[in-house]
Interface confidence: low
């Protein structure tokens, strides 16, 4: 049975709390629900950084910081509709993650 892909969660992992230009940054994107194979795309300021496919556990992407700050997001697509994560904003002083849950209208 096909399972709709859920909205992925993007996690940024840095080697230290105070990140600096040149640091290696690890991006992890995972949709907790979705089948079969999920294609993950990573974005910086809406520009595609790269993509990776995974059956489970999400996907990783590594990059070296070349800018002082920026907005990162990822997208999960299982061929039955894509979902994009909340944007994670990276500052030189650390990470700020913005996520939202359901609300009643």
């Amino acid at each position: 049975v096909a399972v709709p892909v859920s909205r992925p969660v993007l996690t940024l992992r840095a080697p230290r709390a105070q990140v600096a230009v040149g640091d290696l940054l690890e991006l992890h994107c995972e949709a907790l629900r979705g089948s079969p194979l999920i294609l993950y795309q990573f974005y910086h300021e809406d520009v595609t950084l790269g993509n990776s496919s995974a059956l489970s556990g999400g996907a990783f992407f590594n990059l070296s910081l070349t800018a002082e700050h920026g907005n990162y997001s990822c997208e999960a697509d299982n061929g039955l509709g894509a979902q994009r994560s909340e944007t994670v904003t990276l500052y030189l002083t650390g990470l700020t993650e913005n996520r939202s849950g359901p609300v009643a209208t």
Partner: antibody
């Protein structure tokens, strides 16, 4: 705040087509897929299908495959549902609804009433 | 298609009364979500992920269940709770709703 504004009611003859719209505002339109749901007295709530607001890819309930066409216009942040070859059984309220991270509909449009009458 | 069967279809209750409605799925699902709908309005997300209350939903509401069987309970009915409640599954295509339970004033 998040809003989904749908087009007004439609009174149409059998056999014709109708196109209804759903304008999303108050959020990043391309980050959320849009779904369409039919509500009739006989069948309660029925999922018609969804469209990715970013890619335009669609996924249908097989029951509506030959009835419905879904499109999206990113520039105007509007999703469209076209219903073809209308019959009396297509008379219903049609809702657009935003698909959230939790695999559910978190916001709904106000609904568009389609009445098929000769 | 995963058919969701709600019961009862219509339930009469009085303010202050405890009510429970059920939703049975043909096939096992990870989660059930509940929507509340009042006359001439759109459905509103009420309970998500089986037991979590959506923003603004009173604490007298609760949800439970797993697998094929789920329920929504109102511990003490209030006037504003009279409405139709639909269960919904987003775990598999086609997405499906239950036929609804209408709560009426006794």
């Amino acid at each position: 705040q998040v809003q989904l504004q749908q087009s007004g009611p439609e009174l149409v003859r059998p056999g014709v087509s109708v196109k209804i719209s759903c304008k999303g505002s108050g959020y990043t339109f391309t980050h959320y897929a849009m779904h369409w749901v039919k509500q009739s007295h006989t069948k309660s709530l029925e999922w018609i299908g969804m469209i990715s607001s970013s890619s335009g890819n669609t996924n249908f309930n097989q029951k509506f495959m030959d009835k419905a066409t879904m499109t999206v216009d990113k520039s105007s942040t509007t999703a469209y549902l076209e219903l073809a070859r209308l019959t009396f059984g297509d008379s219903a309220i049609y809702y657009c609804a935003r698909w959230s991270y939790y695999a559910l509909f978190d916001y709904w449009g106000q609904g568009t009433t389609v009445t098929v009458s000769s | 298609e995963n058919v969701l069967t709600q019961s009862p279809a219509i339930m009469s209750a009085s303010p202050g009364e405890k009510v429970t409605m059920t939703c049975s799925a043909d096939s096992s699902v990870d989660y059930i979500h509940w929507y509340q709908q009042k006359s001439n309005t759109s459905p509103k997300l009420w309970i998500y992920d089986t037991s979590k209350l959506a923003s603004g939903v009173p604490g007298r509401f609760s949800g439970s269940g797993s697998g094929n069987s789920y329920s929504l309970t109102i511990s003490s009915m209030e006037a504003e709770d009279f409405a139709t409640y639909y269960c919904f599954q987003g775990s598999g295509y086609p997405l499906t709703f239950g036929s609804g339970t209408k709560l009426e004033l006794k």
